[in-house]
């Protein structure tokens, strides 16, 4: 595929990545699938600056990111190492709370109203952010 050199329409460029901010809500898995269909992934926060950038755009609204522990340990959807990477959890989080009455614990991470992170039930219909790197090859075939 050809290398993407600029962001698609309605996406925002920042530090060699493109971001798309939803204005509706979906369950985490549906949001994850939406981003994949756009040749992107749910946002992976790797730095203080990226946290601030995303926070600026989403405002004080619960918003999914590409972090989950549905298979045990916390994992970023693009394979970025969780243990050594940037974290911005709210105090006492993640807590895998079972008291919500919806079955199971809390396996998906989202930005809260103050930008810090919380784990929540993956079925909740939150907004989401997609990210794709400008330097990666796009899946579209090159124009002949």
């Amino acid at each position: 595929g050809s290398e993407r050199t600029c962001c698609p329409v309605n996406w925002v460029e920042h530090e060699r990545s493109c971001y798309w901010f939803s204005r509706s809500g979906k369950a985490w898995a549906d949001a994850d699938n939406y981003c994949r269909l756009e040749d992107a992934h749910l946002v992976v926060v790797t730095s203080w600056e990226e946290q601030k950038f995303v926070q600026h755009h989403i405002g004080p609204v619960n918003t999914w990111m590409g972090l989950h522990d549905q298979n045990g340990p916390w994992k970023w959807v693009d394979g970025t190492d969780y243990e050594t990477g940037f974290k911005n959890w709210r105090p006492e989080q993640p807590d895998d709370w079972y008291g919500h009455g919806l079955g199971g614990g809390e396996d998906c991470a989202h930005f809260t109203d103050d930008g810090r992170w919380n784990d929540d039930v993956c079925q909740r219909p939150y907004r989401w952010v997609c990210e794709t790197e400008l330097d990666k090859a796009s899946q579209e075939p090159p124009l002949l």
Epitope: W48, E49, K52, F53, H56, D114, G115
Partner: antibody
């Protein structure tokens, strides 16, 4: 009310070490990130380091990287700054400050003076 | 690193005057800009965060504005207790950096 009290400052020779402490009270210490900020005599403010509420992230200004270490003991409500290989240019009043919203200092201690001189 | 440039470095004013201090960032910091007041021998005090939000207890004569790279702190009618040094600070990217300060003195 929120209180931050620094201690451990003093006169030290270049190349030596010093450990500053900041005792916190009046709030849930383990819920807040904490910073060290310094001010050389007659000069402006310079941020030194930050540590997350749970210690999961730490950042430093370049001029102290590899020499200073920020740490905390949430069971003692205390923040620390271990300063090694001190230089004359580290002479300053050192303030601890509470973090609000990733980089905003909403409460400050009264400061402790560190003088590096032979 | 993001450089923060404050102007003026000092100004002499009278009680009741309107005071405007500006701060410019070397790159866009969105609205991640704070203002602090410091009096001699004292720790700084947070006045304004996120460019224009008041810290609780701060008098309404203080106000902040701006976004991107250019920011302003305004004191609508200077009071005797406002004579101090004022600093801007960006929180967008570490290392967190301050402006050089603006000393507000009595004329």
């Amino acid at each position: 009310q929120v209180q931050l009290v620094e201690s451990g400052g003093g006169v030290v020779q270049p190349g030596r070490s010093l450990r500053l402490s900041c005792a916190a009270s009046g709030f849930t210490f383990s819920s807040y990130g904490m910073h060290w900020v310094r001010q050389a005599p007659g000069k402006g403010l310079e941020w030194v380091a930050v540590i997350w509420h749970d210690g999961s992230n730490k950042y430093y200004v370049d001029s102290v990287k590899g020499r200073f270490t920020i740490s905390r003991d949430n069971s003692k409500n205390t923040l620390y700054l271990q300063m090694n290989s001190l230089r004359a240019e580290d002479t300053a009043v050192y303030y601890c400050a509470r973090d609000e919203q990733l980089g905003t200092f909403d409460y400050w201690g009264q400061g402790t003076l560190v003088t590096v001189s032979s | 690193d993001i450089q923060m440039t404050q102007s003026p470095s000092s100004l002499s004013v009278s009680v009741g005057d309107r005071v405007t201090i500006t701060c410019r960032a070397s790159q866009s910091i969105f609205r991640y800009l704070n203002w602090y007041q410091q009096k001699p021998g004292r720790a700084p005090k947070l006045l304004i965060f996120a460019a224009s939000s008041f810290q609780s207890g701060v008098p309404s004569r203080f106000s902040g504005s701006g976004s991107g790279t250019d920011f302003t702190l305004t004191i609508s009618s200077l009071q005797p207790e406002d004579f101090a040094t004022y600093y801007c600070q960006q929180t967008y990217s570490p290392p967190l950096t301050f402006g050089g300060g603006t000393k507000v003195e009595i004329k």
